[in-house]
C-alpha cells in the first residue's frame, strides 16, 4: 500500500501546518556550560523528564566537576532547575539516572564523593523527582543500583570490594549479604542469582566460579552450580556456561526452575577464545549465538525448543565481532516472528538476512520497488536491501541510528540501508517497511535521525549533518509524503531526538547546542503535533491487514507459528490521533498443523530441502552425550517437537513409532556433593 516517497511535492499538504506547529513549539535554553547532557523519562505517560548536565575540568591532581539537574513535567516543553534538591552535588554520569520500573516514580542519582569517604552517596526520590533524600552508603558502588522488577523497594548493588549489597527499603538501609561476588542479577519473584569467586578474583577464577541463589534477599543461600564461567537470564530460562572436566572447553546448561535442576543444552562446546551469547529470549524459546573457533568475527545462530535444551541450527556465518562485541541482530518488535541480522560472506562482505518465522528460515531482504542496485551488485537488476545496524555504527559509517520498530506501530520498520549484494560503505538512505519487513520503500534520501510518534500516526525525521540544522521533517502517512517545518530561525548543532518511550506521545524534543566564540549553550525545542492530528481516529480510519500475507489465494496465507493475525491499522490517508490509550486491535485465528510447525527432536535432523525429520546416523545405536535434569534417564521421542509458541491445531500430526533413546548424562555439573544450602547467620 505504498507509493514512492515525496518531500513537499504533490503530497496531500496539511492545511496551516506551519501555524499549528509554530504555536506548539517550545524552546528551553539551559543556562550552563556543560559538556554533556543525559535525559531520562520518569514513569509512563507522566510527562516527567529529568535532564542532568555535567561539566568536568580535569585538573592536575583532582578533577573539578559540576552537575545541574532539570525537571520537566510537560514532556519537555518547560524545564525547572532543581539542582538545589541534590544540594548542588556533582553526579557521576557513568551510573546514569537509575529510574524505577513501571510507574513507581523512583529515581536514584549516584553522587561523586571525596577520596577518603567511607562510602558513596546517593540521592533518592520516590515522587517522580519532586523531592530527593540524600543517603550516605556503607560502601562504594561499582554498578548502578538495580531494582527488583517485582518490587521497586528492593535494590541490589555491587561494591568496589566485590560485596553484594541489598536494600529492602528503597536504599535507605543497606546490608552486605555476600562477599567475593562477580556478577549479580535479579530473577523472577525477587530471587537474586550471583556468581562468587572461591580462590582469588573474578578474573582469575573464571571457569571456577560458583553460582548461588537467594530467594529471601540474603537470609538463606543455595549453591546451584559450580565450575561456572558465566550465567545469564533470558525469558523463563536460566543459562550457565560450565567448564568441562577434561579440557578448557565449556558448555551451556539450562534450567527452567531457577537452578534446582539443570540440563545440558544440545549446543557445541566452546573454547577459551569463543563465547556464547543470548541474542533474544521470550517465554517460549531462545536465540543463541555460538562463536566459531578462531578470530573469525562470526558464528552460528541456534534456536531452542520449549525446554531450552534441543537446538536447531538457524543461521550460519552470523556476524558477531569478538573485538567490539557487535552484532546486528534486531528483534522487529512491530511484527511477531520477525528478526533481522547480518552474515559475513566468504569474501568478507556483509549481507542482511531476515526471518519471518522466528528463525526457521532466513532470506535476503526484498529489493525496494523502483530502486537501482549499487556498485556492490554483480547483476544490476537482481539484488537486495542491506540494513545498517550496530556493526555499521561501530565502524563509524555515516549511520546515525539503528533500525527502529515499535510494538504498537504494527508492521512499521525504519532503517538505514543500501541496495546491492552487500552492505555498502557509501552514504546510506533511509528505508521503511509497512508490512514487517516483507517489502521496502526508500523513505528519505541520505542519513537521518527518526522516531515514531502516536503509535505510527506520525513519523519524524531530522537530517544527519555536520552543519547546524533548523528543519524537522514529518509524515502522517507512514513515510510516503513528507512536510518540512523550520522549528527555529537560529540553527543548532543537533545532538539527539527525544520522545517518550513507547511511541504513544505526540511530542518530540530536538536537542542540541548553539556555539559562540567561547560558550556552548544547550537548548531543546519540543514540538507538539496534537494540532496536526486534530481529531481522534474513528472506526472508518482503520483498515484490515493480514500479517505475514504472501499468497492471498492460499488457505494458509498469513500462518506463522500455527496462527494468523488480522490487524486493524490506520489508513495512510487518515490524519487523526490514535491517542495515548490506543490498543492494537488484532484478531488471531488458529491454522491447521503441518510439518513446518514442528522441529526435529534430539537425535533427529532435517536433511537439506526436506520436511521430514530423520534419525541422525551418527547417533544410531550410540549412547548420547546429553544430560536431562542431571541424571540418567530414558527419553522417548517420535522425532518431532512442536516449535515453541506454535499454536496450530488439527491438520497434520507427525505420527511415527516412539523411540526410546537411552540418555547418558556425562556432565558432573550438579554433582550432589557440590550442592549445599546455607543460612546467612
Amino acid at each position: 500500500r505504498r507509493g514512492a516517497p515525496a518531500e513537499d511535492q504533490d503530497c496531500g499538504r496539511l492545511p496551516d501546518f506551519i501555524a499549528k506547529l509554530t504555536n506548539n513549539t517550545h524552546q528551553h535554553v539551559f543556562d550552563d556550560l556543560s559538556g554533556s547532557v543525559s535525559l531520562s523519562w520518569v514513569g509512563d505517560s507522566t510527562g516527567v523528564i529529568l535532564v542532568l548536565t555535567t561539566f568536568q575540568v580535569p585538573l592536575v591532581i583532582v578533577s573539578f566537576g559540576q552537575s545541574k539537574l532539570y525537571r520537566s513535567e510537560d514532556y519537555g516543553k518547560n524545564f525547572k532547575d532543581i539542582t538545589n534538591l541534590i544540594n548542588n552535588t556533582f553526579i557521576r554520569t557513568e551510573f546514569g539516572m537509575a529510574i524505577g520500573p513501571e510507574n513507581s516514580g523512583k529515581v536514584i542519582l549516584t553522587a561523586e564523593v571525596s577520596g577518603g569517604s567511607r562510602g558513596g552517596r546517593v540521592f533518592r526520590s520516590s515522587d517522580f523527582a519532586k523531592n530527593f533524600v540524600q543517603t550516605d552508603l556503607p560502601f562504594h558502588p561499582l554498578t548502578q543500583m538495580m531494582y527488583s522488577p517485582q518490587n521497586s523497594d528492593y535494590l541490589l548493588a555491587l561494591s568496589t570490594e566485590n560485596g553484594l549489597w541489598v536494600s529492602k527499603n528503597f536504599g535507605e538501609k543497606w546490608e552486605e549479604i555476600h562477599k567475593a561476588v562477580c556478577l549479580a542479577k535479579w530473577g523472577p519473584n525477587n530471587i537474586i542469582f550471583f556468581t562468587t569467586h572461591v580462590n582469588g578474583s573474578c578474573k582469575a577464577d573464571l571457569g571456577a566460579l560458583e553460582l548461588w541463589r537467594t530467594s529471601d534477599l540474603g537470609k538463606t543461600f543455595k549453591t546451584i552450580g559450580v565450575k561456572i564461567y558465566s550465567f545469564g537470564l533470558g525469558g523463563r530460562f536460566l543459562f550457565a556456561s560450565v567448564m568441562a572436566d577434561k579440557d578448557t572447553t565449556r558448555r551451556i546448561h539450562v534450567s527452567t526452575d531457577q537452578g534446582d535442576t539443570w540440563s545440558m543444552a544440545q549446543l557445541p562446546s566452546v573454547g577459551q577464545e569463543q563465547f556464547y551469547s543470548i541474542l533474544a529470549a521470550n517465554e517460549d524459546m531462545v536465540f543463541m549465538h555460538v562463536d566459531e573457533p578462531g578470530d573469525t568475527g562470526f558464528g552460528t545462530i541456534f534456536t531452542s525448543d520449549d525446554r531450552g535444551i534441543v537446538y536447531s541450527k538457524s543461521l550460519d556465518r552470523h556476524l558477531y565481532t569478538t573485538t567490539g562485541g557487535e552484532t546486528d541482530f534486531t528483534n522487529v518488535t512491530s511484527l511477531r516472528g520477525v528478526y533481522i541480522t547480518s552474515t559475513l560472506s566468504e569474501d568478507n562482505s556483509i549481507q542482511s538476512m531476515i526471518t519471518f518465522d522466528q528463525g526457521g528460515r532466513w532470506e535476503h531482504l526484498r529489493k525496494p520497488e523502483n530502486s537501482k542496485c549499487d556498485a556492490t551488485a554483480k547483476n544490476k537488476n537482481e539484488c537486495s536491501l542491506h540494513i545498517h545496524a550496530s556493526y555499521s555504527i561501530s565502524q563509524k559509517l555515516n549511520v546515525p541510528m539503528a533500525p527502529l520498530s515499535e510494538p504498537n506501530a504494527v508492521g512499521i520498520v525504519i532503517a538505514h540501508g543500501s541496495v546491492g549484494d552487500a552492505i555498502s560503505v557509501m552514504v546510506p538512505d533511509v528505508y521503511i517497511s509497512d508490512d514487517g519487513g516483507y517489502s521496502w520503500a526508500k523513505m528519505l534520501e541520505g542519513p537521518h535521525y527518526y522516531t515514531i510518534l502516536d503509535s505510527g500516526g506520525i513519523i519524524v525525521a531530522i537530517e544527519h549533518s555536520n552543519r547546524p540544522i533548523n528543519v524537522i521533517k514529518f509524515s502522517t502517512d507512514e513515510g510516503q509524503c513528507w512536510q518540512s517545518y523550520v522549528f527555529t530561525q537560529e540553527p543548532i548543532y543537533f545532538t539527539g531526538l527525544a520522545s517518550e518511550p513507547g511511541a504513544r506521545s505526540m511530542n518530540i524534543s530536538i536537542w542540541g547546542f548553539t556555539e559562540s566564540f567561547i560558550t556552548r549553550q544547550w537548548v531543546s525545542y519540543t514540538v507538539d503535533f496534537k494540532d496536526i492530528l486534530e481529531r481522534n481516529c474513528e472506526e472508518d480510519d482503520y483498515t484490515t491487514w493480514l500479517a505475514h500475507s504472501t499468497d492471498p489465494g492460499d488457505y494458509k496465507d498469513g500462518c506463522i507459528l500455527g496462527y494468523k493475525e488480522q490487524f486493524l491499522r490506520l489508513r495512510k490517508s487518515s490524519v487523526c490521533q490514535n491517542g495515548r490509550d490506543y490498543v492494537v486491535a488484532k484478531q488471531p485465528s488458529v491454522c491447521p498443523c503441518s510439518l513446518e510447525d514442528f522441529l526435529c527432536d534430539f537425535g533427529y535432523f532435517r536433511p537439506e530441502n526436506a520436511s521430514e525429520c530423520v534419525e541422525q546416523p551418527e547417533l544410531k545405536g550410540h549412547e548420547l552425550e546429553f544430560c536431562l535434569y542431571g541424571k540418567e534417564e530414558h527419553l522417548t521421542t517420535n522425532g518431532y517437537r512442536k516449535i515453541p509458541g506454535d499454536k496450530c491445531q488439527g491438520g497434520m500430526n507427525p505420527a511415527r513409532e516412539v523411540k526410546d533413546l537411552k540418555k547418558k548424562c556425562t556432565s558432573n555439573f550438579l554433582n550432589p556433593t557440590k550442592q549445599n544450602s546455607k543460612s546467612n547467620s
Partner: antibody
C-alpha cells in the same frame, strides 16, 4: 474456479425489506472482503459497504447507515445484504464483489470477482 | 466524500484507435485508483488496480497511469470487444466512490 452466485430477482413494496445472498466458491471465503455495489437503471455504480467474512466486521456508506445490514455464514461461504425501509429509488441491480487483496491489505485494490447481479424492483 | 470526475462522459472511436480516458479525484488518493469495464447487462470487470497494475487476464493494450489526483486509462489499439462503459473508482478513503463513467462507442 472462483465465482460468486447471487440469489434471484426480487419485487418488493415500499417500506418492505429485501435480503440478497451471495454464495462464494473456489477460494477461502474468510480471506477477502465482500463488497456490495448497486446500479440503478441507466446510472453509474454506487458502493454500499463491505463485510470482513472472517470477523463479521462491517463498514457501510453513510447514505445506507441504519438501513443496510451485511452478514455472513462462514459454514456455507455465503454473504448477505439486507436493505430495509425500501423506497422506489432503491430499484437497482445489486452486486456482491470480492475485494482484491494485495499482500496483507484487504482494501485499496478494487474488486476482482463480481456476482451476476440481483435485480430488486421496488414498486407499489 | 471524495468526488471522482471522469472525462469525457462518452466518446466515439474506431477499431485500432488509441483511446485515453481521464479521471480526477477531488483530493489526493495516492495510487489507490482502479478501472473497470462494464458491458450492458453484465457485471463490471476489473482492468487496472493501484493506478497502473494490470489485472491478470486483461490484455496488455490496457494501461493505467497517474497518482495523487490525476489518472489516465489508455487503450493503445481499440478492439471490437472494447466498446463498453469504463468506470474509475477510488479506494483510498471510505466511502469508496466511482466516477460517472465513460461510454466508448463505435464511430
Amino acid at each position: 474456479q472462483v465465482q460468486l452466485v447471487q440469489s434471484g430477482a426480487e419485487v418488493k413494496k415500499p417500506g418492505a425489506s429485501v435480503k440478497v445472498s451471495c454464495k462464494a466458491s473456489g477460494y477461502t471465503f474468510g480471506a477477502y472482503y465482500m463488497h456490495w455495489v448497486r446500479q440503478a437503471p441507466g446510472q453509474g455504480l454506487e458502493w454500499m459497504g463491505w463485510i470482513n467474512p472472517n470477523s463479521g466486521f462491517t463498514r457501510y456508506a453513510q447514505k445506507f447507515q441504519g438501513r443496510v445490514t451485511m452478514t455472513r455464514d462462514t459454514s456455507i461461504s455465503t454473504a448477505y445484504m439486507e436493505l430495509s425501509r425500501l423506497r422506489s429509488d432503491d430499484t437497482a441491480v445489486y452486486y456482491c464483489a470480492r475485494g482484491k487483496r494485495s499482500s496483507g491489505w484487504y482494501e485499496g485494490y478494487g474488486m476482482d470477482v463480481w456476482g451476476q447481479g440481483t435485480t430488486v424492483t421496488v414498486s407499489s | 466524500d471524495i468526488q471522482m470526475t471522469q472525462s469525457p462522459s462518452s466518446l466515439s472511436a474506431s477499431v485500432g484507435d488509441r483511446v485515453t480516458i481521464t479521471c480526477r479525484a477531488s483530493q489526493s488518493i495516492s495510487s489507490y485508483l482502479n478501472w473497470y469495464q462494464q458491458k450492458p447487462g453484465k457485471a463490471p470487470k476489473l482492468l487496472i488496480y493501484a493506478a497502473s497494475s494490470l489485472q491478470s487476464g486483461v490484455p496488455s493494450r490496457f494501461s493505467g497511469s497517474g497518482s495523487g489526483t490525476d489518472f489516465t486509462l489508455t487503450i493503445s489499439s481499440l478492439q471490437p470487444e472494447d466498446f463498453a462503459t469504463y468506470y474509475c473508482q477510488q479506494s483510498d478513503v471510505s466511502p469508496i466512490t466511482f466516477g460517472g463513467g465513460t461510454k466508448v462507442e463505435i464511430k
